[in-house]
């Protein structure tokens, strides 16, 4: 069963973490649905974003972080390892000095921290995908 | 209730047709949701475009047409009478020449006929919002 | 094995200008940001300026602000100051060094060069 | 006045444990980085990401972070180690800022 968009959850991250999305974009890549990833700093969607990652299904990714209201230098990628109509996994992995993206199992994408991900306290993910699974699995200690 | 969103609606168009929206965008304006409004010359998503109207709410407003499968001049505009957190009522209208967009009873953008508006046969309204209404009226013959 | 070495300073009146340059060579010099920091005399370190790999982004502290122009050539592998407008207190040993990201800091310094500005 | 604060001086007996601290309200959210720097020298970076040590440094460096307190420790502390010690950290990602420095003495 579908899960609402957007989607908010409370999430507590550290090294070890990893956050599970499985979804499907709503339309066809020539119309450049949007995925949207934001680990944020508070349960409030307007609170600052530790990592924002936005797919534009077909055409790019783009990562960055938003302090103190203020979005600082994007990183941006090509690989594109998404299908068009097809449904995605993706996992976000917390390791030491960054994010790890992987996409259907394969690694694509990294972030180096900017902002300890300690400070995350929500997790949203939005835009142009229907959404069948949200999992945050904490490294057990 | 709510409509849909992704919405689809087969349509016909021509002078004195007026598409009527109402919705409010499902994230704060500093997070940059998006309105699309996709008027198609078929049924299919993939179809060709002879209106395309995005709202990117807070920043922008940009107008295009998809001929043959491709882009062409983009019309961009700053002006943004939409509100943050919100309700809009979004109307276009085909006027002889070109689409009149109003917002709020507004006029506030326009979009001169690139392609004829009778090609138009569905309207897809979609991105970030929910929606409320959807409308197409004809002109009494 | 990896070198950054500032040049440029020397003495200079006040309201006048001095352009550093910082030369770099053993690792890709376009994959990282780099950053000026000065140390005026008996005191401590203070960032000054900041660059992205591409040059397409620059930072600059408030007491520069305006003044000091941050620029980069990548097929140089080389780093610029451009500090105009100068003051007394801009006086200090200009310091280069590189940073791949917020969580690693600047894990290379050039030996930097001393500026000096007399009224 | 700088966002970080640190102390001015700290002394230790040689072979002894050494502390340095540094405090400043955006330690809980940015990552604190330590450098030595010795007289007419270049700074060193010694802990990188709030305890990381880069290569080359000696063991008995470590760092450590803790709401809005990044601690620099020296375990054993020897002769070689008297210098200036600075932390770094952020006023956002994009703009460092440096304590004002602790003058480490080592009897």
């Known amino acids: 069963s579908l899960l609402p968009v957007p989607y908010t959850e409370a999430a507590s991250l550290s090294t070890g973490s990893t956050v599970t999305i499985k979804g499907r974009p709503l339309a066809c890549f020539l119309n450049e649905p949007y995925l949207q990833v934001d680990f944020h700093t508070e349960m409030k969607e307007e609170s600052d974003i530790v990592f924002h990652f936005q797919v534009c299904f077909g055409r790019r990714v783009v990562m960055n972080s938003r302090e103190y209201g203020a979005w600082k230098q994007q990183v941006e990628s090509k690989n594109m390892p998404f299908q068009d109509g097809q449904e995605f996994e993706l996992s976000i992995s917390v390791l030491p000095d960054k994010y790890q993206v992987m996409v259907n199992g394969q690694s694509s994408y990294t972030f180096d921290h900017r902002i300890k991900p300690e400070a995350v306290k929500m997790v949203q993910v939005w835009r142009d995908i229907s959404l069948t699974k949200f999992n945050v699995s904490y490294l057990k200690r | 209730s709510l409509l849909p969103v992704p919405y689809t609606e087969a349509a016909s168009l021509s002078t004195g047709s007026t598409v009527t929206i109402k919705g409010r965008p499902l994230a704060c304006f500093l997070n940059e949701p998006y309105l699309q409004v996709d008027f198609h010359t078929e049924m299919k998503e993939e179809s060709d475009i002879v209106f395309h109207f995005q709202v990117c709410f807070g920043r922008r407003v940009v107008m295009n047409s998809r001929e043959y499968g491709a882009w062409k001049q983009q019309v961009e505009s700053k002006n943004m009478p939409f509100q943050d957190g919100q309700e809009f009522e979004l109307s276009i209208s085909v006027l002889p020449d070109k689409y009149q967009v109003m917002v709020n009873g507004q006029s506030s953008y326009t979009f001169d006929h690139r392609i004829k508006p009778e090609a138009v046969k569905m309207v897809q309204v979609w991105r970030d919002i929910s929606l409320t209404k959807f409308n197409v009226s004809y002109l009494k013959r | 094995q990896l070198q950054v070495v500032e040049s440029g300073g020397g003495l200079v009146q006040t309201g006048g200008s001095l352009t550093l340059s910082c030369t770099t060579s053993?690792?890709?010099?376009?994959?990282?940001?780099m950053i000026w920091v000065r140390q005026a005399p008996g005191k401590g370190l203070e960032w000054v300026s900041s660059i992205y790999n591409d040059g397409g982004n620059t930072y600059y502290a408030d007491s520069v602000k305006g003044r000091f122009t941050i620029s980069r050539d990548n097929s140089e592998n080389t780093l610029y100051l451009q500090m105009n407008s100068l003051k007394s207190e801009d006086t200090a040993v200009y310091y280069c060094a590189k940073l791949k990201a917020a969580y690693y800091g600047m894990d290379y310094w050039g030996k930097g060069t001393l500026v000096t500005v007399s009224s | 006045s700088s966002a970080l604060t640190q102390p001015s001086a700290v002394s230790v007996s040689l072979g002894q444990t050494a502390r340095i601290t540094c405090q400043g309200a955006n330690l809980g959210r940015y990552y604190g980085i330590w450098y030595q720097q010795k007289p007419g020298q270049a700074p060193v970076q010694v802990i990188y990401g709030d305890s990381n040590r880069p290569s080359g440094i000696p063991e008995r460096f470590s760092g450590s972070s803790s709401g809005g307190t990044a601690t620099l420790t020296i375990s054993g502390a020897q002769a070689e180690d008297e210098a200036d010690y600075y932390c770094?950290?952020?006023?956002?990602?994009?703009?460092?800022?440096f304590g004002g420095g602790t003058h480490l003495t080592v009897l």
């Open positions: 053993g690792f890709t010099f376009s994959r990282y940001w």
């Open positions: 770094q950290s952020y006023e956002s990602s994009t703009s460092p800022v």
